[in-house]
């Protein structure tokens, strides 16, 4: 047993039938020694009497919120949740694997820039009783500072018959140098609390590797004379790192014709601007990627061509 | 410590050729690398993340960008550093500062050519024969190095006695690898910035 | 999901014994309480006894208290209700039911999963 945060504790249970469960002796946070009653989640069946309280912790049902009482009045609380071991590998039932860019991964990160600012979000179909506290550090062994907002549901999307339910958190690196080469991963570490149950979820990274610019801004067509070409251009994306000679782009435009079976062509440069031909109903696109740290390229940005 | 605006130096362009091909050859060893040693930890996750310039040379922050002098973390982030004196970040002495930063790009150039030469050997003993380094990269490390043009006392190749431990030899290699990748890409951002300057 | 199914219903004497089994399978590990409650026509259903867990709490209305006991053998995943001096008025349909919830054990709007009832019939 282990204390989450203060009067939250955490029994760890190894999950097999006949399983002997963990013993927990609850002492009561008073100085009174004598009339003292116990009661479990609100309800007011007297469990037992005197300072401390012996529970054979087996499953979910033997958790829950524990409270010591005098003459009506509350004198303290232990909230026990249980974190499930079967077959020696912890429980991942609260959040889904999202199964990129591998199995197993139920936190993905991604950051705009090398400012040592990052967003991770995972998904889940649970809507009730559910929270969620996360913590992050540059090491593990002598953690450097990263600071973290609190989760917040960022979207709801329907999936078959079910409702999946995305969360996100924002990090940022306590004193962060965007030139800076890492040796050290940066560690998040999500607890997931629902009802009585308690899991937690990590995730290891280098910034550089989860870098994904925002796409290109200010996308402009310019006809060339006389052509069916015309000239494309467009802008470094405001979030991007800067000075933009050091932390530079390169980018990759893509004409596509309106049904997705016609051959797309696709034209990789370093600069700013491009000249391609500009087909009847088709559109350009411009999306963008380091150039010197193949991370993840950036979604699209569109003009149609007419 | 940083790279203040110069006047463009016709000598750079040629490094900046040199480092695109130093960073395409490394990223196709590594690549290499990984897919050879795959029953190895090669991979960025299972690797330790060792620096062998460590505490010898000081290339991010004798080529810092001048516009990130102003973030106290990226003077912070190393005890060694080429330049004590803060009123050279003042003064803007640009050509001193560039051959600070030049300089130390080329002991990196050094030490990891070192490095690589001495482990060639060990794997070039290897019965099984599994992986050599790329000669290709050995020589865009070697064209980089005279084109940023230092004199410098040549350090010998180190020879060990010892029978080699192969298995031990592949896992430095990779850690080699990676770290000289993430060297090449801060060359790379250097003298990118340097040639738009 | 959670089935359950009931057992151990018949018809018995006043003063006579019943012991009702309700055997869990599915996803039992979610459950919070297991319980017993019954139900006679036209009328609410009635909570008649609720283990917590494996049993570190037991809830029984006036009616029944000190006639019937409820237990609970975890490595079967089976719930058990003894049931002692019978009388008329316990007569019912006794379903098993199990919850998820922390809160209300003892309200039956409370609980996710039902069984499909055994009948008890006590005569005089």
């Known amino acids: 047993i282990w204390e989450l945060k203060k009067d939250v504790y955490v029994v760890e249970l190894d999950w097999y039938p006949d399983a002997p469960g963990e013993m927990v002796v609850l002492t009561c946070d008073t100085p009174e020694e004598d009339g003292i009653t116990w009661t479990l989640d609100q309800s007011s069946e007297v469990l037992g009497s005197g300072k401390t309280l012996t529970i054979q912790v087996k499953e979910f049902g033997d958790a829950g919120q524990y409270t010591c009482h005098k003459g009506g009045e509350v004198l303290s609380h232990s909230l026990l949740l249980l974190h499930k071991k079967e077959d020696g590998i912890w429980s991942t039932d609260i959040l889904k694997d999202q199964k990129e860019p591998k199995n197993k991964t139920f936190l993905r990160c991604e950051a705009k820039n090398y400012s040592g600012r990052f967003t991770c979000w995972w998904l889940t179909t649970i809507s009730t009783d559910l929270t969620f506290s996360v913590k992050s550090s540059r090491g593990s062994s002598d953690p450097q500072g990263v600071t973290c907002g609190a989760a917040t549901l960022s979207a709801e999307r329907v999936r078959g018959d079910n409702k999946e339910y995305e969360y996100s958190v924002e990090c940022q690196e306590d004193s962060a140098c965007p030139a800076a080469e890492e040796s050290l991963p940066i560690e998040v570490m999500v607890d997931a609390v629902h009802k009585l149950k308690y899991e937690n979820y990590t995730s290891s990274f280098f910034i550089r590797d989860i870098i994904k610019p925002d796409p290109p801004k200010n996308l402009q067509l310019k006809p060339l004379k006389n052509s069916r070409q015309v000239e494309v251009s467009w802008e470094y994306p405001d979030t991007w790192s800067t000075p933009h000679s050091y932390f530079s782009l390169t980018f990759c435009v893509q004409v596509q014709g309106k049904s997705k079976r016609e051959k797309k062509d696709r034209v990789f440069t370093d600069k700013t601007s491009a000249t391609v031909i500009c087909r009847k109903n088709a559109s350009i696109s411009v999306r963008a990627q380091d150039r010197y740290y193949s991370s993840s390229w950036s979604e699209w940005a569109s003009v149609p061509c007419s | 410590r940083n790279l203040p605006v110069a006047t463009p130096d016709p000598g750079m362009f040629p490094c900046l050729h040199h480092s695109q091909n130093l960073l395409r050859a490394v990223s196709n060893m590594l690549q290499k690398a990984r897919q050879t040693l795959e029953f190895y930890p090669c991979t960025s996750e299972e690797i330790d993340h060792e620096d062998i310039t460590k505490d010898k040379t000081s290339t991010v922050e004798a080529c810092l960008p001048l516009e990130l002098t102003k973030n106290e973390s990226c003077l912070n982030s190393r005890e060694t550093s080429f330049i004590t004196n803060g009123s050279c970040l003042a003064s803007r002495k640009t050509s001193f500062m560039m051959a600070l930063c030049l300089s130390s790009i080329y002991e990196d150039l050094k030490m990891y050519q070192v490095e690589f030469k001495t482990m060639n050997a060990k794997l070039l003993m290897d019965p099984k024969r599994q992986i050599f380094l790329d000669q290709n990269m050995l020589a865009v490390i070697d064209e980089l190095m005279q084109a940023l043009n230092f004199n410098s006392e040549t350090v010998p190749q180190k020879s060990s006695l010892e029978e080699p431990d192969f298995y031990k030899t592949k896992i430095k290699l990779c850690i080699l690898l990676h770290a000289f990748r993430i060297r090449a890409v801060t060359i790379d951002r250097v003298m990118s910035y340097l040639n738009a300057s | 999901q959670v089935q359950l199914v009931e057992s151990g219903g018949g018809l018995v004497q006043a003063g006579g014994s019943l012991r009702l089994s309700c055997a869990a399978s599915?996803?039992?590990?979610?459950?919070?309480?297991m319980g017993w409650f019954r139900q006679v026509p036209g009328k609410e259903r009635e909570f008649v006894a609720v283990?917590?867990?494996?049993?570190?709490?037991?809830y029984y209305p006036d009616s029944v208290k000190g006639r019937f006991t409820i237990s609970k053998d975890s490595a079967k995943n089976t719930v058990y209700l003894q049931m002692n001096n019978l009388k008329p008025e316990d007569t019912a349909v006794y379903y098993c039911?199990?919850?998820?919830?922390?809160?209300?054990?003892?309200?039956?709007?409370?609980?996710?999963?039902w069984g499909q009832g055994t009948q008890v019939t006590v005569s005089s």
């Open positions: 039911a199990a919850t998820t919830n922390r809160f209300k054990n003892t309200d039956y709007t409370t609980y996710d999963y």
């Open positions: 599915g996803r039992t590990f979610e459950t919070i309480a």
């Open positions: 283990i917590r867990g494996s049993g570190v709490a037991t």
